[in-house]
Amino acid sequence: MAVTACQGLGFVVSLIGIAGIIAATCMDQWSTQDLYNNPVTAVFNYQGLWRSCVRESSGFTECRGYFTLLGLPAMLQAVRALMIVGIVLGAIGLLVSIFALKCIRIGSMEDSAKANMTLTSGIMFIVSGLCAIAGVSVFANMLVTNFWMSTANMYTGMGGMVQTVQTRYTFGAALFVGWVAGGLTLIGGVMMCIACRGLAPEETNYKAVSYHASGHSVAYKPGGFKASTGFGSNTKNKKIYDGGARTEDEVQSYPSKHDYV
């Protein structure tokens, strides 16, 4: 029950996270005009990964797409790539995890297959979340660098009557959406990985009792149960015989001098 809950919660959290990553990628407010300590303008500038926008005080908003690919900064291209990779991985992860959900029965899918798929989707969510966090962080770093560069420029070259105003940009809403969404996807992925451990069937090895009747002395070899939860392991129960400690899978039982009295 706890496994199902963990898996279900992981799926929902990841779903919300990926929706957030998609929203952040599409949003125009990755960077917004810094209003602090700046002359108050009747125009507000903000930029996204795909277009830049200007909102006038009247409410009129005009957006222009970045219609060039080669003319864009490499960092912006990298951020775009990271976000898209995050979305693609997340979408595939969601698709895989739907089939992996314990509450959904598909044909005669074994628990081991579900465990496999749960782990796969979990890893995908983790990588997706990391891609989003990395993309947003790279963009934020770019903003911080440009902010201080433009601040330095604001206080230089102001000789003469004519002054130029450098538009400084600060963190936009999309960055916070991206960070939160990336974090949620990451958490969801970790939850899926945890759920996977509980989904994998237990591999129980029975050490059987072996009787050696050589003469009248009986050798009793007690053995405990060896339980392990492994991924993709042989799920057959293995009887381990003391005679050469070979499993019944490995060797056919040929009559030997010890088998019969």
């Epitope: 926008c53 200007v54 005080s57 009247s58 409410g59 004519v162 002054q163 105003v165």
Partner: antibody
């Protein structure tokens, strides 16, 4: 069609306050902003302030302490209040609609004359 | 506050002539976000309120005759009347529409001989 009409007291004594009303028709105050501009006799234009569709305001920094602009959307009226009036506040007071593009002022009222005199 | 300086303060021309008047701002009115200059031109005929002629420095308001054209960028702007008509007798004001407070130039008075 778009129309703006100013109405004010006409004559005010020095150090007194005044309120001028701008009644608009042909557009909604929830969609467009309204600016106030004054013009002393034989002189140029001086921007006083603006109230935007959302209700936010901006004022001329030189007059900020004694000017306030507000509005009543349901009555389609905009008000400018000025206190501590002096003789140099004598002017023709205009209200004008904020253009949707370019931050210009696209429709103007005919103006109302204010004389500050004892 | 942004200072808007217009020149000349007045000029007299004959009908049919080409006229140019200048407007300078103390700071750039160019917005980097959309590469638009937030400068507006108005015409005020005697006894009338001002009328919007040009916004974004060069975009003519609808209904304004084609003979009125605006140009310039940054801090230097020009209003040109390609062929002055008698009805163009007016005072022309430029306005900073970028920084608050919005400020007007002193005006250029156009007189017809």
């Amino acid at each position: 069609q778009v129309q703006l009409k100013e109405s004010g007291p006409g004559l005010v004594a020095p150090s007194q306050s005044l309120s001028i009303t701008c009644t608009v028709s042909g557009f909604s105050l929830t969609t467009y902003g309204v600016h106030w501009v004054r013009q002393p006799p034989g002189k140029g234009l001086e921007w006083l302030g603006v109230i935007w569709a959302g209700g936010s305001t901006n004022y001329n920094s030189a007059l900020m302490s004694r000017v306030s602009i507000n509005k009543d959307n349901s009555k389609s009226q905009v008000f400018i209040k000025m206190n501590s009036l002096q003789a140099d506040d004598t002017a023709l007071y205009y209200c004008a609609r904020a253009a949707y593009y370019g931050n210009g002022l696209d429709y103007w009222g005919q103006g109302t004359t204010l004389t500050v005199s004892s | 506050d942004i200072v808007m300086t217009q020149s000349p303060s007045s000029l007299t021309v004959t009908a049919g002539e080409k006229v140019t008047m200048s407007c300078k701002s103390s700071q750039t009115l160019l917005n980097s976000g959309n590469q638009k200059n937030y400068l507006t031109w108005y015409q005020q005929k005697p006894g009338q309120p001002p009328k919007l002629l040009i916004y974004w420095a060069s975009t003519g308001e609808s209904g304004v005759p084609d003979r009125f054209t605006g140009s310039g960028s940054g801090t230097d702007f020009t209003l040109t009347i390609s062929s002055v008509q008698a009805e163009d007798l007016a005072v022309y004001f430029c306005q900073n529409a970028y920084f608050y407070p919005f400020t007007f130039g002193g005006g250029t008075k156009l007189e017809i001989k």
